[in-house]
């Protein structure tokens, strides 16, 4: 605690500081999302969103942030993703976003308002001052896990999984030694917060990268482990090998081609 206190005074943490122009970026993204990307959300007041976001971490110790701190923001940014349209991902962020860029009716967390606002940003405040710390923020490994960014993603990931319904897809990286990683956000948060009374199937897409690769990665031991966890929760599990992710990129190059979406 004394180390935290000293560090808070010096504001020297092990991670990078708040992203430059953070308040402006949040407001700009909010306006773009609610007015252009998803006009159904145009009722959202972006100034209120920023105030609630700010309220979650400003003047608070950046190692003592709780999920409760983000509840006002979650309430304001509440959004319903249609059933069968949730795409989770683990170590396939770029590919998952290429997919939803083409298949516009499918949502990753970063395609929802709150995920869109915070994607790739860093932020933290300082204890007992209303300042935003642009110099450094706590690193999850070096400093503490209850930092503003980590707690935010854990909170919104939990909510995203809880609200999913129907068939949920997850895109996994077949090039990793552990295709399903229990320590990832998907493995530690999302898997355990899917609601069996709403979600009837989790379908894993194991993305291959190798040209000419024809292994069945759905037989990987970590996938069997995922199947066990999901089945124990009374959710049907399915796994598919996806061998040609380059098709995403080719479609993304010409997004104006509406035939590239899989409504055949």
């Amino acid at each position: 605690v004394s180390r935290w206190h000293q560090q808070s005074q010096r504001s020297q943490w092990g991670g990078r500081g708040t992203t430059d122009r953070f308040p402006e970026i949040i407001l700009e993204r909010c306006v773009e999302y609610t007015q252009t990307l998803l006009p159904e959300m145009r009722h959202v007041d972006c100034q209120n969103i920023w105030d609630a976001f700010k309220g979650a971490f400003i003047s608070k110790h950046p190692c003592k942030i709780t999920e409760e701190d983000y509840q006002p923001l979650l309430k304001l940014g509440n959004q319903t993703v249609p059933c069968n349209k949730t795409l989770l991902w683990s170590r396939t962020k770029h590919l998952a976003h290429q997919y939803t860029e083409i298949q516009r009716d499918v949502f990753t967390l970063e395609d929802t308002l709150l995920g869109y606002l915070a994607d790739d940003l860093t932020w933290c405040g300082e204890f007992e001052t209303s300042e935003i710390n642009y110099r450094s923020c706590p690193d999850w490994r070096k400093d503490c896990s209850s930092n503003p960014v980590s707690v935010f993603w854990k909170t919104v990931s939990r909510r995203f999984a809880e609200s999913a319904c129907g068939v949920v897809h997850v895109m996994l990286n077949g090039s990793c030694s552990n295709i399903f990683d229990k320590k990832s956000t998907f493995g530690s948060v999302e898997v355990h917060n899917l609601q069996p009374e709403k979600v009837h199937t989790l379908e894993a897409w194991v993305m291959h990268d190798g040209r000419g690769d024809s292994r069945d990665l759905c037989q990987d031991p970590s996938i069997k482990e995922l199947e066990l966890i999901i089945s124990k929760r009374n959710i049907t599990f399915s796994c598919k090998n996806i061998y040609r992710p380059d098709k995403f990129l080719q479609c993304a190059k010409t997004p104006e081609d509406s035939s590239c979406i899989s409504k055949i």
Epitope: R211, C218, N241, Y243, E256, C260, I261
Partner: antibody
């Protein structure tokens, strides 16, 4: 609407060569994998070859590897199959087929086919 | 390489349900596609991604895939459904395979 029109089939002697073409229209040609599938008289379907949209990746069935070459000209919206060292067992209707997008690898659209007969 | 096995023929009375199977090792780990082919015509995609129906395909066509077997189901079979049906899957690289085909006969 999507249209695929094959041409270039005909009668050829064993050991001979033939070049098939497939003219595509009604979609952004460069966004899709394209394929050749054949069907011998009275037999089932057999996938022959496939090519990615860009076209850096090409794939061949073992039965034609080293003899057939798939290529495409995205500026002309045309798919090709160069067939060399033809054998009697290559006699078939050859279909040009457009792949499904994204996670799916099946054939959404097919041409009407062009008949290749290898006989002396 | 996976091998897909289909029954050579299936017969069904009009209005009844026809089921055509397609089996292969761990087939559930791969998406399956079904094509209908009538004499002298090119194949037509009737099911993709195990169970999805392309636009324009009647609702009586459905598909499933579990274990080692995928199934094409035609409920309320009509005379016009008489055709050859092929299943297909892709197991990476140059392993794109079709089943041997099933001739569906609508009796009467």
């Amino acid at each position: 609407q999507v249209q695929l029109v094959e041409s270039g089939g005909g009668l050829v002697q064993p050991g001979g060569s033939l070049r098939l073409s497939c003219a595509a229209s009604g979609f952004t040609f460069s966004s899709y994998y394209m394929n050749w599938v054949r069907q011998a008289p009275g037999k089932g379907l057999e996938w022959v070859s496939g090519i990615s949209g860009d076209p850096s990746n090409t794939y061949y069935a073992d039965s034609v590897k080293g003899r057939f070459t798939i290529s495409r000209d995205n500026s002309k919206n045309t798919l090709y199959l160069q067939m060399n060292s033809l054998r009697a067992e290559d006699t078939a209707v050859y279909y040009c087929a457009r792949d499904l997008p994204l996670v799916y690898t099946g054939f959404a659209y097919w041409g009407q086919g062009t008949l290749v007969t290898v006989s002396s | 390489d996976i091998e897909l096995t289909q029954p050579p023929s299936v017969s069904v009375a009009p209005g009844q349900t026809a089921r055509i199977s397609c089996s292969g090792d761990n087939l559930r780990h791969y998406y399956v596609y079904w094509y209908q082919q009538k004499p002298g015509q090119a194949p037509v995609l009737v099911i993709y991604g195990d169970s999805k129906r392309p636009s324009g395909i009647p609702e009586r066509f459905s598909g499933s895939n579990s274990g080692n077997t995928a199934t094409l189901t035609i409920s309320g079979t009509q005379a016009e459904d008489e055709a050859d049906y092929y299943c297909q899957t892709y197991t990476g690289g140059a392993s794109l395979v079709f089943g041997g085909g099933t001739k569906l006969t609508v009796l009467g």
